[in-house]
Amino acid sequence: KSPVFGPQEVSSVEGNSVSIKCYYPPTSVNRHTRKYWCRKGASGRCITLVSSEGYVSSNYAGRANLTNFPENGTFVVNIAQLSRDDSGHYKCGLGINSRGLSFDVSLEVSQGPELPNGTEVYTVDVGRTVTIKCPFKTENAPKTKALYKKIGQTSVLVIDSRNYVNPNYKDRIRLRIPGTGQLIFTVVIDRLRLSDHGLYLCQAGDGSNRDEKNADLQVLEPEPELVYEDLRGSVTFHCALGLEVANVAKFLCRVNSRETCDVVINTLGKRDSAFEGRILLNPQDKDGSFSVVITGLRKEDEGRYLCGAHSDGQLQEGWPIQAWQLFVNEESTIPRSPTVVKGVAGGSVAVLCPYNPKESQSLKYWCLWEGAQNGRCPLLVESQGLVQEQYEGRLSLLQEPGNGTFTVILNQLTTQDAGFYWCLTNGDTRWRTTVEIKIIEGEPNLKVPGNVTAVLGETLNIPCHFPCKFSSYEKYWCKWSNTGCQTLPSQDEGPSEAFVNCDENSRLVSLTLNPVTRADEGWYWCGVKQGHFYGETAAVYVAVEEKKVAGSRYVSPAKADAAPDEKVLDSGVREIENKAIQDPRLFAEEKVVADTGDQAGGSRASVDSSSSEEQGGSSK
């Protein structure tokens, strides 16, 4: 399918002008190639009428032009002084006329209505309000005022000053007669319907002295705003319906093949399951305006969308609406990234988030989509490092690999972490993407101890066990903070407080702190990566305590207060009937450090890797 997009149908009246906007993917080639507007003939050929290279056909001379807007990926064709002969089938496109990079546009130019002299024309959008002004002479001031609608040769009474209201206008029309001295009455019609369209007649008095005034009411369906967005990207529909419906339920719906409108989301809590996890209805402003954001755009999201207001939260005739025609461009600049990421309980996930590579300095965010009511997405982490408290020690946003992608790591997974998350920046909103985290059966691949307690001044050595499949990966330990996870520098950086010395074929990588200081307390992550692409992680919390008095720490295996089948153990692991119940934080992410000799003074932190004959259980 062609990635060029424009209005399918354009209608106007003789003598008027039209402006037709066509969209194209703003690649370097497309921005600079020829743009054209051509008319399809009976033979199927398309004859150029105007192009971006300056050509204008004789038929269009002096009344048409084509302007390219390469920075937006659009071009606009303006045609003035329309005649009935301009009705027909056209194409807007790129390159050569027959190549297929085009969009079909139907133009219909109709004859303007033959209106009686002195007819006032009122042009109003469906659902809105019109006020028809009806002047009269002093002598008709005390007489009956009325509004009729002309249908063919007959006139149907709509409303009069004797309290008659035509049933078709019930509860939405009123006739106002001003105080003395003002020789004008008004008829106000609310919530206009398409069927209200037509010629009306104001009348004051009767007989030959009556006052009459013709009014032509044109009720327009809102012209759909064309919206051109990339596959996998995001779209925002801004809906401003006016103060008169500020306190009425709002909705967004999509027009289906039967020309009815299926609710996508509304403020009454309804949401189409096809948009689960990727839609938000943002709170209304005081003026009743609101917006709907849809991320992770799919080709099947294309179509005509309407937003509106009605107490039922769905489309009803005569209520204000706004319209959009959404086109999803498959030649997307947004890279493919997994829409579902799977992790195991106790394990971790590393999520790749795309952003506009032109905005490398933008702030990056990650939020959790919550479906309740209209949906919300509270931020969990941002590139400046702020993390929601309940994610402390298990969530980090990394700028790597960069160049249009950042990484979010979440570990110590539980079933409650399953759900939809959004990647976003404070820059281009079209690059918002959605990822679903699913928690599946299995064991974490990286194994670290549960709660670890270090003693001030002593050596601490924590192992991280990994399966053979990670032998080709780079292993690391890092110390977590709310601004990221600081990897320990490698050995070739010279003497330092921390160094890495990891045998690449090993299946055990260890963190050594020697001697332990107060500053060592906190979360450590053990992880694997390939270049700038992060894999699994496991986290361990290291608590630091003062040296205990000798002999006060240990519990005898035969201690009387332990149940006969239960041993009280030292690290948060209870052993009952020979079954170890691991502390839920047994698996966590960490940084890698190297082993030093017996009671060595040497470097304070190091990483070591050593081979292991058995490999830990693997979930994959």
């Epitope: 003693v455 924590i462 192992p463 066990h465 830990g616």
Partner: nanobody, 125 residues
Framework: QVQLVESGGGLVQAGDSLRLSCAAS??????????MGWFRQAPGKEREFVAS????????YYADSVKGRFTVTRDNAKNTVTLRMNSLKPADTAVYYC????????????????WGQGTLVTVSS
């Protein structure tokens, strides 16, 4: 999880040597993932730390009372840890326990997760 079985205890004369072994079995993680330690408990006394060794064998730590006399080693291929005791004294008489930990901590506060049943060492004068 890990099962630990000690062996090698017995009655010896003061000044003699003895070698205790601890065999580990179980498939939670491989043996060389665990730091190993030795403890002892004399009749009527608290259990006390004797020695520890990290999973690679590169780091060891001893209680002051045994430093220079006892040596701890491990053979990861055979899933065993050994405590070589020289110049034994009557004060060394105790039940000796082998322990395994998920991480290594130097000092006398070895973070044991798993314990053996113990083997008795008696040193007569």
């Amino acid at each position: 999880q890990v099962q630990l079985v000690e062996s090698g205890g017995g009655l010896v004369q003061a000044g003699d040597s003895l070698r205790l072994s601890c065999a580990a079995s179980g498939r939670t993680l491989s043996f060389d993932t665990y730091a190993m330690g030795w403890f002892r408990q004399a009749p009527g006394k608290e259990r006390e730390f004797v020695a520890s060794i990290d999973w690679s064998g590169g780091t060891t730590y001893y209680a002051d009372s045994v430093k220079g006399r006892f040596t701890v080693t491990r053979d990861n291929a055979k899933n065993t840890v050994t405590l070589r005791m020289n110049s034994l004294k009557p004060a060394d008489t105790a039940v000796y326990y082998c322990a395994a930990a998920q991480y290594y901590r130097s000092g006398t506060s070895f973070p044991a997760n798993y314990w053996g049943q113990g083997t008795l060492v008696t040193v007569s004068s």
